[in-house]
């Protein structure tokens, strides 16, 4: 007898994991055998779709590999033409083990700023997210919070927040761990110990001390009166993210010394500065009788001529004595290019010692003139011919007025080493005695006006003169 369809096994809710099998059963009793159709969210399932399997005349519908998108309401409808069609529905809930879709990444952050480590997850049931720092679960506090999204937010990042982090996503089906990431906390450069100001006597040695910290460890540079320090020695050491820099100075003039600590944060730099003043006891601005100060020679032209670290007199009648006197020497040396090979080294020695006179430090720095004997040795022995030309140019006013120092020294006005050996400066480069000089042919027709002294011997001779050179 014909019998209208009756669903004997109504559909139930099916839970399935992604990639698993899910089966709905819709057992039907009827005669004749019914046509069974299936829908998902009221859309007909095509039975030739290879993602599905149909068994037992449509009474079993199997999804062979569940996807996220399969979630929904499934209904089976049975109809055999006898009575009305019957329907039963059930839900497919696609369950999913936790999956971290946006894992955290390594972060570099400056102390005091806000850091956010992402951890976006998927899963059904919705996973709960927690974080591990190092090997221990991370505790939330007023600064540290796990957001609804799973991301970790750290307000006012501190140095101690640095370390290795990973997020953990958990639901009833399993647990997923992110890879371990590094939170690096960078700290602006900061000076821990500033250099101290000193009031010292002229010619003292002073050590300025500057200590700085930061992450990364900063570098320290020293500035003297606005320029990079050119003299003095710097010693540095680094320990536990602290850099210690010591600048040792030989004090010949007052100055402002600045310690600058710098470190880099990405493309930007942070700096910290601290300054110290060096003043010289009883130092005052040059008076009428105090026309300059002593300082180490820092130029280039006279480097080979003047003794290393020589204290020279800098004339404060110039705005910038060092630069002005260097320019004078430079200009004069260019004039010397045309003189004879015998004259030139002697003239250079005389010129450098005349323009950059040796300096006697003290309450009133005093220039020490060249000894007359050395001046005469250059004038009448080595450079007789050239000297005449230079004197003539000076008298005819061929040198500009500001070049008055270029006027060759008047040897007769210079102190003699016989009067007071400490009152004048010697030219160590002229290491010739009378015996050497006698081998030279006569330099002029006139007799030297004074007896050429025995010049002191020096091991640092910067030139030698062969007797075969002609002076004419």
């Amino acid at each position: 007898l014909p019998k209208a369809p009756v669903i004997t096994t109504p559909l139930e809710t099916v839970d399935a994991l992604v990639e698993e099998v899910a089966t709905f059963m819709c057992a039907v009793e009827s005669y004749p055998q019914p046509e069974i159709s299936w829908t998902r969210n009221k859309i007909l399932i095509k039975l030739f779709d290879t993602r599905y399997s149909i068994r037992e005349n449509g009474q079993l519908l199997t999804i062979l590999s569940v996807e996220d998108s399969d979630d929904g309401i499934y209904c089976c409808t049975a109809n055999n033409g006898v009575g009305g069609a019957v329907e039963s529905c059930g839900a497919l809930q696609v369950k999913m083990k936790p999956k971290i879709t946006r894992p955290p990444i390594n972060v570099k952050i400056i102390e005091g700023l806000k850091a956010v480590l992402p951890c976006t997850t998927m899963g059904n049931p919705k996973p709960s997210v927690s974080w591990i720092k190092g090997d221990s679960p991370l505790r939330e506090n007023s600064r540290i919070a796990v957001l609804e999204s799973g991301s970790l937010r750290i307000h006012n990042v501190q140095k101690e927040d640095a370390g290795q982090y990973r997020c953990v996503a958990k639901n009833s089906l399993g647990t997923a761990y992110s890879k371990v990431v590094k939170l690096e906390v960078e700290v602006f450069a900061r000076i821990l110990r500033a250099p101290e100001s000193h009031n010292v006597t002229f010619g003292s040695f002073v050590t300025l001390h500057c200590t700085a910290t930061g992450i990364p460890v900063p570098t320290i540079t020293w500035i003297e009166n606005g320029n990079a320090v050119s003299s003095g020695s710097i010693q540095e050491s680094v320990k536990d993210r602290v850099i210690d820099s010591r600048l040792q100075l030989f004090i010949t003039k007052p100055g402002l010394y600045t310690c600058i600590a710098t470190n880099k944060h990405g493309e930007k730099f942070s700096t910290a500065k601290a300054a110290a003043t060096i003043s010289i006891a009883e130092w005052s601005k040059p008076q009428k009788d105090n026309k300059g100060y002593c300082a180490q020679y820092r130029g280039e032209v006279c480097n080979a001529v003047l003794a290393k670290d020589a204290l020279v007199f800098l004339n404060t009648s110039y705005a910038d004595p060092e630069e002005a006197q260097e320019l004078l020497v430079h200009t004069a040396w260019n004039e010397l290019k045309v003189v004879s090979p015998v004259c030139r080294p002697a003239a250079e020695a005389l010129l450098c010692n005349h323009i950059f006179q040796e300096c006697s430090p003290g309450v009133v720095p005093t220039p020490i003139p060249i000894c007359r004997e050395y001046c005469l040795a250059v004038k009448e022995l080595f450079c007789a011919k050239e000297w005449l030309v230079m004197e003539e140019k000076t008298h005819r006013g061929l040198y500009r007025s500001e070049m008055h120092l270029l006027s060759v020294p008047e040897c007769s006005k210079l102190p003699s080493m016989h009067w007071d050996p400490t009152a004048c400066a010697r030219l160590p480069h002229l290491d010739y005695n009378k015996e050497n000089l006698k081998t030279f042919p006569p330099m002029t027709s006139s007799k030297p006006s004074v007896d050429i002294p025995n010049l002191p011997s020096s091991s640092s001779s910067s030139f030698s003169v062969s007797p075969t050179y002609s002076m004419t």
Epitope: T9, E12, V14, D15, A16, L17, E20, V21, T23, M25, A27, Q33, S53, I54, R55, E56, N57, Q59, L60, T62, L64
Partner: antibody
Framework: EVQLVESGGGLVKPGGSLRLSCAAS????????MAWVRQAPGKGLEWVSS????????YYADSLKGRFTISRDNAKNSLYLQMNSLRAEDTAVYYC??????????????WGQGTLVTVSS | DIQMTQSPSSLSASVGDRVTITCRAS??????VNWYQQKPGKAPKLLIY???TLQSGVPSRFSGSGSGTDFTLTISSLQPEDFATYYC?????????FGQGTKLEIK
């Protein structure tokens, strides 16, 4: 009474072919899904293949796909298994079974006595 | 494929003992599990279907339970004719799979 009788087993060389048959009686064959299940000597049961009553739905065990073919002739109430490229590991007793929709899922409620297939050189 | 893992693989027991065999599925399969008994040289016989329903003609000492992934076959009081090999089978997927079997022997 449901009856299933297998035939066609025997000795075959590796690489050879064999066709098994199953004669069914005592039930509406054309309305029933039929299956082959095998059992290697001293081993467990292994489902091989199933075919729906109208032959529209056919399934094979993944490991056998491409070498075995299930078919049926409802007019003759017969089920067949064509086995090609036979290997030593195909040596087993092959059972013909009727699949039946149960309260949940399907089960094999009737079995034949089995036919032995030996693949050996 | 859905794997069915049966334990133990063999079991020695005496007549009158209560025996339990378990079967675990590799994914949730609702109650789509059947149990079979096979004696040496014979074809398997359906004992229990839909995880817990006794096939007609099967003695009531046999019972089945479980849902999801874990299933159990229990023989409340072993009889001499119960010494055989038992198999679980899933039909949740159309690619049917059996457990590897549990051989029940007389102690």
């Amino acid at each position: 009474e449901v009856q299933l009788v297998e035939s066609g087993g025997g000795l075959v060389k590796p690489g050879g072919s064999l066709r098994l048959s199953c004669a069914a009686s005592g039930f509406t064959f054309s309305a029933s899904t039929m299956a082959w299940v095998r059992q290697a000597p001293g081993k467990g049961l292994e489902w091989v293949s199933s075919v729906s009553g109208d032959s529209h739905h056919i399934y094979y065990a993944d490991s056998l796909k491409g070498r075995f073919t299930i078919s049926r002739d409802n007019a003759k109430n017969s089920l067949y298994l064509q086995m090609n490229s036979l290997r030593a590991e195909d040596t087993a007793v092959y059972y013909c079974a009727r699949e039946r929709l149960l309260r949940l899922g399907v089960g094999f409620d009737s079995w034949g006595q089995g036919t032995l297939v030996t693949v050996s050189s | 494929d859905i794997q069915m893992t049966q334990s133990p693989s063999s079991l020695s027991a005496s007549v009158g003992d209560r025996v339990t065999i378990t079967c675990r599925a590799s994914q949730r399969i609702s109650g789509f599990v059947n149990w079979y008994q096979q004696k040496p040289g014979k074809a398997p016989k359906l004992l229990i279907y839909a995880a817990s329903t006794l096939q007609s003609g099967v003695p009531s000492r046999f019972s089945g339970s479980g849902s999801g992934t874990d299933f159990t076959l229990t023989i409340s009081s072993l009889q001499p004719e119960d010494f055989a090999t038992y198999y679980c089978q899933q039909s949740y997927s159309p690619l049917y799979t059996f457990g590897q079997g549990t051989k029940l022997e007389i102690k």
